[in-house]
Interface confidence: medium
């Protein structure tokens, strides 16, 4: 099974070769290269020196080889870099190239969503409901769930909205939002609203959005 690797958008992924080199072979005897699942070459070290004529344009200038750890560093990660990678090592002998090692890695690229933000899109109408939108941007993969918590002195209610999502054509990052009409006809105390974004790994909470409800006015004194 391939080694699973996780790295973050715009950062660097380490793609290992995990070559034990038990025979202590010099790089000058070896051809080491990495290719992706479409057989596009990321990097080639030919007899100890990097060679670029095979490197695909999408990887050009984005890699660096660490000869101590036999690891390729892929820089400026994009979402489209996710997938399978192979490190392959050939030994150059007088009789020709002999494949002596192969290592498969599976790269997942993540991007942290921004802290969810609550924006009211209407005023409180006669203390009955409020329209609000909660949004979070520039994340990957798409989140599992987005919801709103309405907390009062006595209770907590969770509202699940329909999550709207859009994906950037270039970066492939997601922006997500939900719009809700939160009703509180019977509430007389102050409320705090939170927005929660759940991904496979994290739970992001917005800053609290407070609503201070005016106390009902007492009826005017009866004057006989």
């Amino acid at each position: 099974a391939p080694l699973k690797i996780q790295a973050y958008f715009n950062e660097t992924a380490d793609l290992p070769c995990q070559f034990a080199n038990s025979q202590n072979q010099s790089l000058s005897e070896l051809v080491v290269f990495w290719q992706d699942q479409e057989n596009l070459v990321l990097n080639e070290v030919y007899l100890g020196k990097e060679k670029f004529d095979s490197v695909h344009s999408k990887y050009m200038g984005r890699t660096s080889f660490d000869s101590d750890s036999w690891t390729l560093r892929l820089h400026n990660l994009q979402i489209k870099d996710k997938g399978l990678y192979q490190c392959i090592i050939h030994h150059k002998k007088p009789t020709g190239m002999i494949r002596i090692h192969q290592m498969n890695s599976e790269l997942s690229v993540l991007a942290n969503f921004s802290q969810p933000e609550i924006v009211p899109i209407s005023n409180i109408t006669e203390n009955v409901y409020i329209n609000l939108t909660c949004s979070s941007i520039h994340g990957y993969p798409e989140p599992k769930k987005m919801s709103v918590l309405l907390r009062t002195k006595n209770s907590t209610i969770e509202y699940d909205g329909v999550m709207q999502k859009s994906q950037d054509n270039v970066t492939e990052l997601y922006d997500v939002s939900i719009s809700l009409s939160v009703s509180f006809p019977d509430v007389t105390s102050n409320m705090t609203i939170f927005c929660i974004l759940e991904t496979d790994k994290t739970r992001l909470l917005s800053s609290p959005f407070s609503i201070e409800l005016e106390d009902p006015q007492p009826p005017p004194d009866h004057i006989p």
Epitope: K51, S54, G61, M97
Partner: antibody
Amino acid sequence: QVQLVQSGAEVKKPGSSVKVSCKASGYTFTDYAIQWVRQAPGQGLEWIGVINIYYDNTNYNQKFKGKATMTVDKSTSTAYMELSSLRSEDTAVYYCARAAWYMDYWGQGTLVTVSS
Amino acid sequence: DIVLTQSPDSLAVSLGERATISCKSSQSLLNSRTRENYLAWYQQKPGQPPKLLIYWASTRESGVPDRFSGSGSGTDFTLTISSLQAEDVAVYYCSQSYNLYTFGQGTKVEIK
């Protein structure tokens, strides 16, 4: 000694295809890449692409994608380049060259003339 | 794409005199990790394929006379023929292999 021997001159009609061969000898064929370069009459050198035989990878100059197709036959130590949809501006001498980081041995060149 | 610009386009030099050809790259050809410049020089005589003279910017290919030398780093490179001989009449090309391959437009060297 290292030798790259290319196929003979060709005269082709516009719209047709041509396949140029490059037979290698004097070294282990799978140890090196083969580059293809063209030179139009009275013009400079233009890189077409590379085929890395030791791990079956091709890379093309963007200009020649869809025009040139590079292949190899390891059993006969021969590299091929096929040019499709020929036009008069494809008239040129086509060279193969053995290469690692630079092209140290070249074929004698194949003149392809495209004329109606 | 990396663009290589040679100068001059043509050069007439007396026998025994020095000929100097410049090659400028639109981006650095120096691999900072290995300290190599991915630049080569080729000589092409009429009706013949190109012949490798210099690689890694300054390493002479075996069998090439020592009157040919290469220098430079990064974006500026020079091929020098220290004492021009009649058999040196040819077109000279620089070529980079830092990002795929490209050639300069060529410099024609003639005898004055």
